[in-house]
Amino acid sequence: MAVTACQGLGFVVSLIGIAGIIAATCMDQWSTQDLYNNPVTAVFNYQGLWRSCVRESSGFTECRGYFTLLGLPAMLQAVRALMIVGIVLGAIGLLVSIFALKCIRIGSMEDSAKANMTLTSGIMFIVSGLCAIAGVSVFANMLVTNFWMSTANMYTGMGGMVQTVQTRYTFGAALFVGWVAGGLTLIGGVMMCIACRGLAPEETNYKAVSYHASGHSVAYKPGGFKASTGFGSNTKNKKIYDGGARTEDEVQSYPSKHDYV
C-alpha cells in the first residue's frame, strides 16, 4: 500500500514538475527589466528563451522572436537545449511511469517489469529535473554577470549631453518556476526510485535441503551466506539507484487600431 502511494505520489509530483518545466520554457519572463531605480517605467522590457517583449505604459505589449540560430549567445542555446532535454526526458519518463503504476493492470505484466519501469522513469525524472535546474541556473548566472557588467557601464557616454542608458535585467518569474519545477521533478524521480525498491519481488527464503554425506548425516541449510544474498536483487537495485545518484552529480556538473483587452 505504502509502495503504491509512494509511486503514485512520485508520479503526480513529477507530472506537476514537468508541467512546470514546460511552462517555464515557454514563458517570456526569464529576465525582466530591473526597476530598482525606476519603479514606474513607460517601457518595460522582458525576455524569454524564444522572444523578447516590451510592455508599454499604454498597455500594449509587443514581442519579437529570435529569428536567428547562429546569432544567439551560446549560453542561451545551451539553456534551450537543457530545457528541451529536460522536457523530452520528463515526457518519456511520464509515459513509462504510467505503465509502471501498480494501480494500473496491463495484461500479465510482472512486478519485476513494473519495478524496472518505475526505476527507469525515476532516473529519467531525476535527470529531467537536473536538466531544468541546470538550465535555469546557467541563465541566472548569465543574468548576474550581465547585471554587474551593465551596472559598471551604466552610462556609456556618447559625447556632450547625450547618453545611452543600458537596460539592466534581473531574474524573471520563469526562473523561479523553473527552479521549483525542476526540484519537484527531481523529488518525484527520487520517490519513484524509492517505490521501485518496494515493488521488486523479494526472493523467498530457500527451503532447507538435506545433503546426505557418506557416514554422516548433516543437514546443510544454504542460508548462511546465501540467505544474505536473498537481498541480492535489492542490493543490485540499490546499486542501480546509486548509479542514478551519480548520474545526478554528472548532470549537475554540466554547466490597424484594435482594442487590446
Epitope: 517601457v43 499604454s58 498597455g59 487590446y260
Partner: antibody, heavy 118, light 113 residues
Framework: QVQLVQSGAEVKKPGASVKVSCKAS????????VNWVRQAPGQGLEWIGM????????RLNQQFKDKVTLTVDTSTSTVYMELSSLRSEDTAVYYC???????????WGQGTLVTVSS | DIVMTQSPDSLAVSLGERATINCLSS????????????LTWYQQKPGQPPKLLIY???TRDSGVPDRFTGSGSGVDFTLTISSVQAEDVAVYYC?????????FGQGTKLEIK
C-alpha cells in the same frame, strides 16, 4: 468614430481650483490610458500625466504632483483633471488625449483654455 | 528627464520641395525588448490640437500621407516631408515615449517660401 470632447473655457482667480472634463466616445473607454498635455500661449507642449480608466491608476509628471488630480467616471466615460492653487503661469490650453501604441497620443480633445487672472 | 532638442526652430520651404526636421534626444529611445524607438512626431496647425503623424520613429499613423517619413534610431531622429504642400504649414513636435515624464521638443515651425 473616436472622439474626446472637453469642457468649455474657464476664467479663474489666483488660488482657486478648476476641474476640466474630457468625455470619451467611439472606443472601449476602459482599455486605453488618457493623458493630459498643456500648452501655454505661444509655447510648446508639456506632458502633465495620464490615468487608466479601468483602475484609476495614474502616472504624473513630478512637476505637477501637487497641482493636478486626475479622476475617472467610468459610468459616463469621462476623465477629469483638477488644477488647484491656480497661478497666472497656469494659464494655458489643456488637452486630453488617448494613449496609443508606442506611447503616442493618437486622438486629442479640442482643448480647454484655462485663464488665471486677478 | 529626457531632453528633446529640435532643429531648426523654423523652416521655410518652397512648395514641392523637401523639408527635413531633426530631433535629438538626450538619451537613447531604443527599447531592447522589441528593438523599437519610442519617438513620436506630431503636427499642430494654428488653433488646433496636435495630430499624430508618426510613432515608433517610423510608423505612419493611419490616414497620414506617405510624403511624411520618420527615420533614425537611438538618439538622432528625422522627420522628412518629401514634397511640401500648402496644408503642411504647421508646427512639428517630436516626443519621447520611452520614459516618464514624456517630454516634447520645443517645436519646429514650417512655412512656405
Amino acid at each position: 468614430q473616436v472622439q474626446l470632447v472637453q469642457s468649455g473655457a474657464e476664467v479663474k482667480k489666483p488660488g482657486a481650483s478648476v476641474k476640466v472634463s474630457c468625455k470619451a466616445s467611439g472606443y472601449s473607454f476602459t482599455n486605453y490610458w488618457v493623458n493630459w498635455v498643456r500648452q501655454a500661449p505661444g509655447q510648446g507642449l508639456e506632458w502633465i500625466g495620464m490615468v487608466h480608466p479601468s483602475g484609476s491608476e495614474t502616472r504624473l509628471n513630478q512637476q505637477f504632483k501637487d497641482k493636478v488630480t486626475l479622476t475617472v467616471d467610468t459610468s459616463t466615460s469621462t476623465v477629469y483633471m483638477e488644477l488647484s492653487s491656480l497661478r497666472s503661469e497656469d494659464t494655458a490650453v489643456y488637452y486630453c488625449a488617448r494613449v496609443w501604441s508606442g506611447n503616442a497620443f493618437d486622438y486629442w480633445g479640442q482643448g480647454t483654455l484655462v485663464t488665471v487672472s486677478s | 528627464d529626457i531632453v528633446m532638442t529640435q532643429s531648426p526652430d523654423s523652416l521655410a520651404v518652397s512648395l514641392g520641395e523637401r523639408a527635413t526636421i531633426n530631433c535629438l534626444s538626450s538619451q537613447s529611445l531604443l527599447a531592447s525588448g522589441n528593438q523599437r524607438n519610442y519617438l513620436t512626431w506630431y503636427q499642430q496647425k494654428p488653433g488646433q490640437p496636435p495630430k499624430l503623424l508618426i510613432y515608433w520613429a517610423s510608423t505612419r499613423d493611419s490616414g497620414v500621407p506617405d510624403r511624411f517619413t520618420g527615420s533614425g534610431s537611438g538618439v538622432d531622429f528625422t522627420l522628412t516631408i518629401s514634397s511640401v504642400q500648402a496644408e503642411d504649414v504647421a508646427v512639428y513636435y517630436c516626443q519621447n515615449g520611452f520614459s516618464f515624464p514624456f517630454t516634447f521638443g520645443q517645436g519646429t515651425k514650417l512655412e512656405i517660401k
